[in-house]
């Protein structure tokens, strides 16, 4: 008795976080025996789409010419071989940016900070939002994700960092979102350059949760130590 068909691999190019109006291609890679590929979108009638395999039959392309709110969400794919349907792929979360106006990102007391001192990055939105994300350029994952406790909407979120080391230096952006769909984010804030000066080099801050990624240690989430989130917001890791 043969075991279940191996699950396919699902990914998006150029990535899974796409600006509104930009194109994205979803790929599903199975085996050379695949006869058909199926893509399912959570909370949409299944199958969401079907495609014949591209030669040499081990993958299929699902094209999205222009990203819109409707495409944002969680996807899984399957392939059909002569012996039946495969297991589902691991989910792909397709996130759209540009759903809301961009927040403002600032550093308190200043974006120029001495190593060993404290700094707070402040993300402010014009309209009340309940989720805020802080992103560091070239990081593989959001650094921090602050979500309001009881659906209470906030105009801002604070991301305290203490003590600051050279690892914290770099370019940051933040996004805001509504809880009803964490697949829809605002336009990114303008970039903020955090400059760490001085030689008070303490130990590297270590993440409170390990993240499986092929990237180097600089790309791991940085958990500010001894910090308290903005009132009404709780820290939440994606």
């Amino acid at each position: 008795q043969a075991g279940p068909l191996p699950k396919p691999t699902l990914w998006a190019e150029p990535g899974s976080v796409i600006s509104w109006g930009n194109s994205v291609t979803i790929w599903c890679q199975g085996t050379l025996e695949a006869r058909e590929y199926r893509l399912d979108k959570e909370e949409s009638p299944a199958p969401w789409d079907r495609q014949n395999p591209l030669e040499p039959k081990n993958k299929a392309r699902f094209s999205i010419p222009s990203m819109t709110e409707d495409y944002a969400g969680r996807y899984r794919c399957y392939y059909r071989s002569p012996v039946g349907w495969s297991q589902p792929s691991d989910p792909l979360e397709l996130v759209m940016t540009g759903a809301y106006s961009k927040p403002t990102l600032s550093a308190l007391p200043s974006p120029l900070v001495t190593s060993g001192k404290s700094v707070t990055l402040l993300c402010q939105s014009r309209s009340p939002m309940d989720t805020f994300l802080l992103i560091k350029e070239r990081a593989a994952h959001p650094l921090l994700h602050l979500r309001s406790e009881h659906g209470a909407q906030q105009h801002q979120a604070e991301f305290p960092m203490s003590p600051v080391t050279s690892v914290h230096g770099g370019t940051y952006r933040c996004f805001s979102s509504h809880g009803f769909s964490h697949y829809l984010l605002s336009h990114p804030s303008d970039p903020l350059e955090l400059i760490v000066s001085g030689s008070l080099e303490g130990p590297r801050p270590s993440p409170t949760r390990s993240v499986s990624t092929a990237a180097g240690p600089e790309d791991q989430p940085l958990m500010p130590t001894g910090s308290v989130p903005h009132s009404g917001l709780r820290r939440h890791w994606e």
Epitope: G21, N22, S63, P65, T68, D70
Partner: antibody
Framework: QLQLQESGPGLVNPSKTLSLTCNVS????????WSWIRQPPGKGLEWIGY???????NYHPSLQSRVTISVDTSKNLFSLKLTSVTAADTAVYYC?????????????????WGHGTTVTVSS | DIQMTQSPSSLSASVGDRVTITCRAS??????LAWYQQKPGKVPKLLIY???TLQSGVPSRFSGTGSGTDFTLTISSLQPEDVATYYC?????????FGQGTKVEIK
């Protein structure tokens, strides 16, 4: 069957604002990109911009500073405003539709077009 | 911005001839390409989308191929009613640029 109909003044004075409306009849505006295209006399097609039913827009970079496209889904229409017009803006202006989502059929090219309205910029 | 370049700008062929029009994108656009036919004094009409998918109601003598940067529109057997200007257009990320057009005439 979906039909598009452009309307607006055929003559606009230089430096003034060109305003056109596209009336959408026989179908829904949801999940489509609603586009404006123009064609100067004897020349090719030029894409101006589009609006999605959510209100998000994209414009041709060369016109970005002068163009605004808006939508009123309750009245089934979308509009074009082009400020500070010159003789170079004289053209036939078309409105057109492109499918925006798998559920809406053709999500490729501009599959439904209005008949076009001629706009002349002159004093 | 990505530029779309069509060639030739015009051509003259006999009824029954095979006619080929090419469109080149300055950067890759996957298969996000449409072809339109515009007869003199008329509204443009969608012929092909997704580079090779024939729009409903379009005669099968029209076909499209290509992906990435190079695309082709072929009329397998030119008919008198095919006299028109043909445009390619990219429709992925904005701007949705058109090619400059190819005018097709009968010899």
């Amino acid at each position: 069957q979906l039909q598009l109909q452009e309307s607006g003044p055929g003559l606009v004075n230089p430096s003034k604002t060109l305003s056109l409306t596209c009336n959408v009849s026989g179908g829904s505006m949801s999940n489509y990109f609603w586009s404006w295209i123009r064609q100067p006399p004897g020349k090719g097609l030029e894409w101006i911009g589009y609006i999605y039913n959510s209100g998000n827009t994209n414009y041709h970079p060369s016109l970005q500073s002068r163009v605004t496209i808006s939508v009123d889904t309750s009245k089934n229409l979308f509009s074009l405003k082009l400020t500070s017009v010159t003789a170079a803006d004289t053209a036939v202006y078309y409105c057109a539709r492109r499918g925006g989502y798998y559920g809406s059929g053709n999500y490729g090219g501009l599959d439904v077009w209005g008949h076009g309205t001629t706009v002349t910029v002159s004093s | 911005d990505i530029q779309m370049t069509q060639s030739p700008s015009s051509l003259s062929a006999s009824v029954g001839d095979r006619v080929t029009i090419t469109c080149r994108a300055s950067q890759g656009i996957s298969n996000y390409l449409a072809w339109y036919q515009q007869k003199p004094g008329k509204v443009p009409k969608l012929l092909i989308y997704a580079a090779s998918t024939l729009q409903s109601g379009v005669p099968s003598r029209f076909s499209g191929t290509g992906s990435g940067t190079d695309f082709t529109l072929t009329i397998s057997s030119l008919q008198p009613e095919d006299v028109a200007t043909y445009y390619c257009q990219k429709y992925d990320s904005a701007p949705w640029t058109f090619g400059q057009g190819t005018k097709v005439e009968i010899k």
